[in-house]
């Protein structure tokens, strides 16, 4: 079965940025990864950023940057410009659409405790949904 | 099928403002990711930049920042792009097109004459 | 921003024959990570918005008859089209699709003789 790993990562140097790390574990194609924050796409989520394979990568503030780490895996830089740091206790969602297996998405946090430059383990919440 | 509509030609006089529309059909709602493009007469094509339906969030061309707002109703599934302080400079064919410029509006020109 | 060139800015063929038009990105347009180039070819017909012809340097998209072909890698790419048709008649434009603000090329303009 598809699997979909998340990791949120504060910079040790920088307390406001944070990286999302996805990975996509299976056979199969991708066609496109979403990645949400507040919640799963189309579930009360709010999309920051669309990456395509080939015709390129988009994404919205607080997201600073969206890029292809591996041909299965993206990041995604966040730049938080409050004085709070909202991130903490937002979880992120990304959505793999892969062919021929359909669409699967997991969820991650920063942990409470995270030290600066501590990722989250990568144990994801998987919503597997195969649209 | 997905089909990007324009609203028609427009005369305006300089120093005005002026909203044209773009309103999509044939996708889902939250998909309606959409670029603005300009091409000048006998000229490339612009980035004029882009808006994300989930959020408003905005991008934009450096140069076409303070010139061009953009905003959408999700009701209607319609996008808008307001430029200001019209110039002849900004007489043009504006375009909108989907997230990955795969699919492109008719266009819609925009005539600034005193 | 990444300056996209191309060349030359107009040609003319006959029907039948091959064509080559050129693209030069000031940037390389390739992603490391999962080593595609993000470049995009369009086609403007008199009247008409941009098609999408090519995408990721060469990847045909749907519908384009096969007679069109992308190629290239990092900052030069190239569009032939094998056997010109009359229907080919159009402005052909190259786009940065790596970075914003996504630049678009000069443009070609291929005549049919």
């Known amino acids: 079965t598809p699997e979909v790993w998340v990791q949120v990562q504060m910079e040790a140097t920088e307390l406001s940025s944070f990286t999302v790390h996805c990975g996509f574990l299976g056979p199969g194609s991708i066609s496109l990864v979403t990645v949400s924050w507040g919640g799963p796409d189309g579930a009360g989520g709010t999309k920051l950023a669309v990456l395509h394979p080939e015709l390129g990568t988009r994404q919205w503030a607080p997201a600073r940057q969206a890029r292809w780490e591996t041909q299965s895996s993206i990041s995604l830089a966040l730049e938080d410009s409050g004085a709070s740091s909202p991130f903490a206790n937002t979880t992120f969602c990304c959505k793999f659409a892969s062919f021929p297996e359909g669409s699967w998405e997991s969820c991650g946090s920063l942990p409470p405790s995270s030290d600066p430059g501590l990722s989250a383990p990568p144990t994801p919440v998987p919503i597997l949904r195969a649209d | 099928e997905v089909q990007l509509q324009q609203s028609g030609p427009e005369l305006v006089k300089p120093g005005a403002s002026v909203k044209i529309s773009c309103k999509a059909s044939g996708y889902t709602l939250t998909d309606y990711y959409m670029n603005w493009v300009k091409q000048s007469h006998g000229k490339s094509l612009e980035w004029i930049g882009d808006i994300n339906p989930n959020n408003g969030g905005t991008n934009f061309n450096q140069k076409f920042k303070g010139k061009a707002t953009l905003t959408i109703d999700k009701s209607s599934s319609t996008t808008y792009m307001e430029l200001r302080s019209l110039t002849s400079e900004d007489s043009a064919v504006y375009y909108c097109?989907?997230?990955?410029?795969?699919?492109w509006g008719q266009g819609t020109t925009l005539t600034v004459s005193s | 921003d990444i300056v996209m060139t191309q060349s030359p800015s107009s040609l003319s063929v006959s029907a039948g024959e091959k064509v080559t038009m050129s693209c030069k990105s000031s940037?390389?347009?390739?992603?490391?990570?999962?080593?595609?180039?993000?470049l995009a070819w369009y086609q403007q017909k008199p009247g008409q918005p941009p098609k999408l012809l090519i995408y990721g340097a060469s990847t045909r998209e749907s519908g384009v008859p096969d007679r069109f072909t992308g190629s290239g890698s990092g900052t030069d790419f190239t569009l032939t089209i094998s056997s010109v048709q009359a229907e080919d008649l159009a402005l052909y434009y190259c786009q940065n699709a790596h970075s914003s603000p996504y630049t678009f090329g000069g443009g070609t303009k291929l005549e049919i003789k």
């Open positions: 097109a989907s997230l990955f410029f795969d699919y």
């Open positions: 940037q390389s347009l390739l992603n490391s990570g999962n080593q595609k180039n993000y």
